[in-house]
Amino acid sequence: KKVVLGKKGDTVELTCTASQKKSIQFHWKNSNQIKILGNQGSFLTKGPSKLNDRADSRRSLWDQGNFPLIIKNLKIEDSDTYICEVEDQKEEVQLLVFGLTANSDTHLLQGQSLTLTLESPPGSSPSVQCRSPRGKNIQGGKTLSVSQLELQDSGTWTCTVLQNQKKVEFKIDIVVLAFQKASSIVYKKEGEQVEFSFPLAFTVEKLTGSGELWWQAERASSSKSWITFDLKNKEVSVKRVTQDPKLQMGKKLPLHLTLPQALPQYAGSGNLTLALEAKTGKLHQEVNLVVMRATQLQKNLTCEVWGPTSPKLMLSLKLENKEAKVSKREKAVWVLNPEAGMWQCLLSDSGQVLLESNIKVLPTWSTPVQP
């Protein structure tokens, strides 16, 4: 008996071939001997089966001696043995219909779990193997679960159902809702305008929800809500914003915040949360601000940084085009009695300059100028 695997919702074509290459009388029946369809002269005839409106044939093949049974919009319960009667012969085809669906929604928040459930006909014992977009393989029976979804799990999951040495492939598109970056860091000189961007790693037709940016300044004992906002169909509207600092927010996606001035008291870490409508849980992105200040007070030239810097970062003071006078893995460096000229304060990571501030030291009889 020939075995054919089908997918729920798809169309299957069961073949039936006669030795004579011409249109002759044929009938398709199910295992209960109920007629599904056949031919009568020029007409296609249909029997009283449950398949009535979903059963079809391809008349262009009849004169070649082929009499297919086409079943549209397959259902699990269409799984059965189908019998083609032609030229006093009987051809049997066993059809097994499978369905594979995601637990709830195919749009899931980062960190959530994905469960895939296999629908199969009674008496079948299929095995399932799924391959994620990043190439991870998972195997299972009726259900497959993946916990802690990551951004790289977004995309098409390809699942293969195996039964009777035959296989059928399902493709399920999964969207992991997350920000493009889990964390970002902005380096700014004191007084400069700061731009924070929070691009999303997904696109959806309508995006509605609400969000908030909490800020923990390095100098503050507790965190504070800097801004709250609403998102409606990708349009952003500010609900509440602190007076100090007075953040500005873009009206369109990607989420964009502007801090008019980088000041030492703002240096620190923020956490932007976004709660999406009809989703449990929130999206998070961490943002860090590092602020640099170079000053000269009397005979002391100082360079300081505030904010979350890694211990391997190097802070240096050097006279332009000369070797660094001082270089330390600390948040403040200084030079006493600096000679006149353009001094550079540099924050670097393995030789790569992250932040630079210049200060002009004038001969001792005049006051310093900060460009």
Partner: nanobody
């Protein structure tokens, strides 16, 4: 009363085109799959093309595939057959019919003659 009335036949030169129409009445046209058949002179009736009730799926006899196009307008209760690159062997009486029996409806036919 069920009626299928074909029109649009006539005399045409080889390589020419014709568009046949079939006006349906007396039944719910939009629920039935339909077909075109022809009867060449001195030969039996042969099936040419099928179209499902929605117009999404079509099927053609190999010798007319690529030259003939079956279509339908359910709002106007009308079935069409666009015939291009006509040949002398396309001469015959053209019939529209329901694809299935029951109900087994046939039209009266329209004559198509392809000759120079």
């Amino acid at each position: 009363e069920v009626q299928l009335v074909e029109s649009g036949g006539g005399l045409v030169q080889p390589g020419g085109s014709l568009r046949l129409s079939c006006a349906a009445s007396g039944f719910t046209f939009s629920r039935l799959a339909m077909s075109w058949h022809r009867e060449p002179p001195g030969r039996g009736r042969e099936w040419l093309a099928d179209i499902d009730s929605s117009g999404d799926t079509t099927d053609y006899l190999a010798s007319v595939r690529g030259r003939f196009t079956i279509s339908r307008d359910n709002a106007r209760n009308t079935l069409y057959l666009q015939m291009d690159s006509l040949r002398s062997e396309d001469t015959g009486v053209y019939y529209c019919a329901s694809r299935e029996d029951p109900p087994g409806y046939w039209g009266q036919g329209t004559q198509v003659t392809v000759s120079s």
